[in-house]
Interface confidence: low
Amino acid sequence: EVEKTACPSGKKAREIDESLIFYKKWELEACVDAALLATQMDRVNAIPFTYEQLDVLKHKLDELYPQGYPESVIQHLGYLFLKMSPEDIRKWNVTSLETLKALLEVNKGHEMSPQVATLIDRFVKGRGQLDKDTLDTLTAFYPGYLCSLSPEELSSVPPSSIWAVRPQDLDTCDPRQLDVLYPKARLAFQNMNGSEYFVKIQSFLGGAPTEDLKALSQQNVSMDLATFMKLRTDAVLPLTVAEVQKLLGPHVEGLKAEERHRPVRDWILRQRQDDLDTLGLGLQGGIPNGYLVLDLSMQEALS
């Protein structure tokens, strides 16, 4: 904390301008009025203050607004935003999309920092909703942000936002999120040819229904086991042995290593053992030969 000292004669700042870059830290503290700084924050970004000087300016704003900065100040923070801590940001109430954009611009070119994550969280809470414009803004800056949204929030994500998503951007998405994202991805990539389509849709297949997996099995896609293991269990269970063999292609041999894991284990339990035997992988646990297999819907009808 900067020691309180009287402002030298004639040095009292009348406005925020470039003359202040020649002020020592203690002079900034003593000679710049916090209220003046708050009303002229838009000028700060155009002045080449040192990091140390920015620390002083932040300190003055903190003193003026101990409960958190008003949005009129936040919108014009510029590079001073980089000096904020998540604790500082949690005190804010950000509702303007322009404010959010202005601060994201400051962090442009960097991965999402704790400060940005906190800012977005405060924005969403302050705004009370995630409309299309908000989602467009967030996904444009941070495609991986999709996975931090709830399924309800994801429902308003436009398919156009899906284009910039890379596989690793979906690493933290859970099946419920993929259930929402998959139909959007399917729509976004619908005009691509088979091989290109599969490359793009593959990361989203954790949300694919059975009928789409059946369709993929007819396209020689050679799905790898890592992708197969991320598929919805309820989508895998109805697949026949022949369909899984076509879906996985040369990777079907990988089922053996995964036979104790879901969804493979569940799938094995619902297949005829003689069908499993045709794979030649030594998979065990299928329905014994000679047992009557009833379709679940038929079973319900009979009961």
């Epitope: 490359v199 793009k200 086991l225």
Partner: antibody, heavy 120, light 107 residues
């Protein structure tokens, strides 16, 4: 026909910062369909990806260079730039800028490359 | 980081030969595998993307196959203009990485 053109000094002194710019012509750098990358190739050696930038400014850097690299984009000039600080002779290479097609996941268009020598 | 291992590092072949170059990833990269051709003093040129898709304008004698960790680039009938260095590259995960290259020379 989209073309990429690298520009910048061909000689940089050790410990200084290497700065290169890639100008995109025949297409917009603001298209959401592409990532814009820098790749380098030391004389007689293989290719090394330095990093890429999306039109929004989001970047991914190679961890081996991350502490020294900054990639930025200027959509108004249809350019993106590379800054590599604290260079040594090991940074001597041909530096390429390239466009990565998001759909294909591949570098479909490359600049012709610019040789940068680090020497005093 | 995902390591990409190419083999062989160099090979000698004659015009008309069938040439196969392999690329192995240190972990599964699905189908995010590309092949490039580079001639001396020139920038690399994309041949194959997504493991098996032929880039527009590339002759059909080039083909790619594989998925997961093992990939192959095949030149069905080597032509004089095909003598160059070939690189594989994964785009599944950052950092994006290239194989060490395979130099195809005239026998």
């Amino acid at each position: 026909q989209v073309q990429l053109q690298e520009s910048g000094p061909g000689l940089v002194k050790p410990s200084q910062t290497l700065s290169l710019t890639c100008t995109v012509s025949g297409g917009s750098i603001s298209s959401g369909d592409y990532y814009w990358s820098w790749i380098r190739q030391p004389p007689g050696k293989g290719l090394e990806w330095i990093g890429y930038i999306y039109y929004s400014g989001s970047t991914y850097y190679n961890p081996s260079l991350k502490s020294r690299v900054t990639i930025s984009v200027d959509t108004s000039k249809n350019q993106f730039s590379l800054k590599l600080s604290s260079v040594t002779a090991a940074d001597t290479a041909v530096y390429y800028c390239a466009r990565e097609d998001v759909v294909k996941g591949a570098f479909d268009i490359w600049g012709q490359g610019t040789m940068v020598t680090v020497s005093s | 980081d995902i390591q990409m291992t190419q083999s062989p590092s160099s090979l000698s072949a004659s015009v008309g030969d069938r040439v196969t170059i392999t690329c192995r990833a240190s972990q599964s990269i699905s189908s995010y595998l590309n092949w490039y051709q580079q001639k001396p003093g020139k920038a690399p040129k994309l041949l194959i993307y997504a493991a098996s898709s032929l880039q527009s304008g590339v002759p059909s004698r080039f083909s790619g196959s594989g998925s997961g960790t093992d990939f192959t680039l095949t030149i069905s009938s080597l032509q004089p203009e095909d003598f160059a260095t070939y690189y594989c590259q994964q785009s599944y995960s950052t950092p994006l990485t290239f194989g060490g290259g395979t130099k195809v020379e005239i026998k």
